[in-house]
């Protein structure tokens, strides 16, 4: 007896974080034997959509012409072959930005940081929110941070980083959100450029330093500040 059909692969183009009004295409790739593809959205009647496969039948396209709140959420897809339905794909979490006004991002004590010291990025919203996220441009995993630790509504969240090294340098933005829908984020904050300098005593980069002259570990750009991953936006460090 043959085992269960292998699960398909589900992804979104141009990505899984989409601004309000922009288009997104969800792809489900199965096998050449697929006869039909089905897309299910969590907390929506199943199936959310069905599509015939595109030649050579190993994938199907589900199009969203204009992103709105209704499309944000968690998706899985399946395919049907002559022997039955496949296992579900791993989930795809489609996040919409632009649901709320943009927060403000600042660096304490300053966006100019000496290697080996600390910096705290502060994300502030005009209205109380319960989730704040920090992202770094051009990172291997662009969405880097966890949910704000506090469940209570608040106007700001602090993202501590220590010790700072050159890899922390770059452009950051933050988002705010409400816990009732993890898939709806604010407009992004204006960018904040974090500039990391060497120590005053030894400005030249050096692979090995005594901490009396310089400091600062961490190849990974950022680490968690809270206890619960933000749905759809978790960085893969575990």
């Amino acid at each position: 007896q043959a085992g269960p059909l292998p699960k398909p692969t589900l992804w979104a183009e141009p990505g899984s974080v989409i601004s309000w009004g922009n288009s997104v295409t969800i792809w489900c790739q199965g096998t050449l034997e697929a006869r039909e593809y089905r897309l299910d959205k969590e907390e929506s009647p199943a199936p959310w959509d069905r599509q015939n496969p595109l030649e050579p039948k190993n994938k199907a396209r589900f199009s969203i012409p204009s992103m709105t709140e209704d499309y944000a959420g968690r998706y899985r897809c399946y395919y049907r072959s002559p022997v039955g339905w496949s296992q579900p794909s791993d989930p795809l979490e489609l996040v919409m930005t632009g649901a709320y006004s943009k927060p403000t991002l600042s660096a304490l004590p300053s966006p100019l940081v000496t290697s080996g010291k600390s910096v705290t990025l502060l994300c502030q919203s005009r209205s109380p929110m319960d989730t704040f996220l920090l992202i770094k441009e051009r990172a291997a995993h662009p969405l880097l941070h966890l949910r704000s630790e506090h469940g209570a509504q608040q106007h700001q969240a602090e993202f501590p980083m220590s010790p700072v090294t050159s890899v922390h340098g770059g452009t950051y933005r933050c988002f705010s959100s409400h816990g009732f829908s993890h898939y709806l984020l604010s407009h992004p904050s204006d960018p904040l450029e974090l500039i990391v300098s060497g120590s005053l005593e030894d400005p030249r980069p050096s692979p090995t330093r005594s901490v009396s002259t310089a400091a600062g570990p961490e190849d990974q750009p950022l680490m968690p500040t809270g206890s619960v991953p933000h749905s759809g936006l978790r960085r893969h460090w575990e």
Epitope: P207, A215, E218, D219, Q220, M223
Partner: antibody, heavy 118, light 107 residues
Framework: EVQLVESGGGLVQPGGSRKLSCAAS????????MHWVRQAPEKGLEWVAY????????YYADTVKGRFTISRDNPKNTLFLQMTSLRSEDTAMYYC???????????WGQGTSVTVSS | DIQMTQTTSSLSASLGDRVTISCRAS??????LNWYQQKPDGTVKLLIY???RLHSGVPSRFSGSGSGTDYSLTISNLEQEDIATYFC?????????FGGGTKLEIK
């Protein structure tokens, strides 16, 4: 479950050498910076050395600089501390610990004891 | 280097008590203050990071507060398993430094 297990401790003569190891499991070792921290008998904790996830950045406390070398083997999920020119004041329990990136060390090993004595 | 001072080296309390342990830094450490628990067998665990954030799996009876140079750890309802030595650590600037520890004992 995150686990850090140190080994390699023992009795060493003054001026001698010793290499400590820390075997990591339960997390993606290659994405975390790592520390060595030590504790002399009946004393407090003392930070010793740090290595970033990709080994590009290394730092030492002044008390061990030039004598100790921290390194790591990411494919083998192992952290090392090579100790040379050992002194009696290096006698301590040596712990490896994982760095959070927020100024803390979130998981620690059980420690390995190094005694420097003739 | 930043010096960390825990003025109380040992503390006796009764089960159920509210216990506060203090820590002072020689300069402003901008809330980069962490608390660790070391059990008699040598096991070290992170309790609180960045002054007040509870590490995952740590009971909610532990809390932290402070700013600038003065920080504290509070255990709201002391339990037998809390008997340990508590260390503060600054993560603001390398070299990271620890307080001398506060040993908590049962009355």
């Amino acid at each position: 479950e995150v686990q850090l297990v140190e080994s390699g401790g023992g009795l060493v003569q003054p001026g001698g050498s010793r290499k400590l190891s820390c075997a990591a499991s339960g997390f993606t070792f290659s994405t975390f910076g790592m520390h060595w921290v030590r504790q002399a008998p009946e004393k407090g904790l003392e930070w010793v050395a740090y290595i970033s996830s990709g080994s590009s950045t290394i730092y030492y406390a002044d008390t061990v600089k030039g004598r100790f070398t921290i390194s790591r083997d990411n494919p083998k999920n192992t952290l090392f501390l090579q100790m040379t020119s050992l002194r009696s004041e290096d006698t301590a329990m040596y712990y490896c610990a994982r760095s959070t990136g927020t100024g803390a060390m979130d998981y620690w090993g059980q420690g390995t004891s190094v005694t420097v004595s003739s | 280097d930043i010096q960390m001072t825990q003025t109380t080296s040992s503390l006796s309390a009764s089960l159920g008590d509210r216990v506060t342990i203090s820590c002072r830094a020689s300069q402003d450490i901008s809330k980069y203050l962490n608390w660790y628990q070391q059990k008699p067998d040598g096991t070290v665990k992170l309790l609180i990071y960045y002054t007040s954030r509870l590490h995952s799996g740590v009971p909610s009876r532990f809390s932290g507060s402070g700013s600038g140079t003065d920080y504290s750890l509070t255990i709201s309802n002391l339990e037998q398993e809390d008997i340990a030595t508590y260390f503060c650590q600054q993560g603001n600037t390398l070299p990271w430094t620890f307080g001398g520890g506060t040993k908590l004992e049962i009355k």
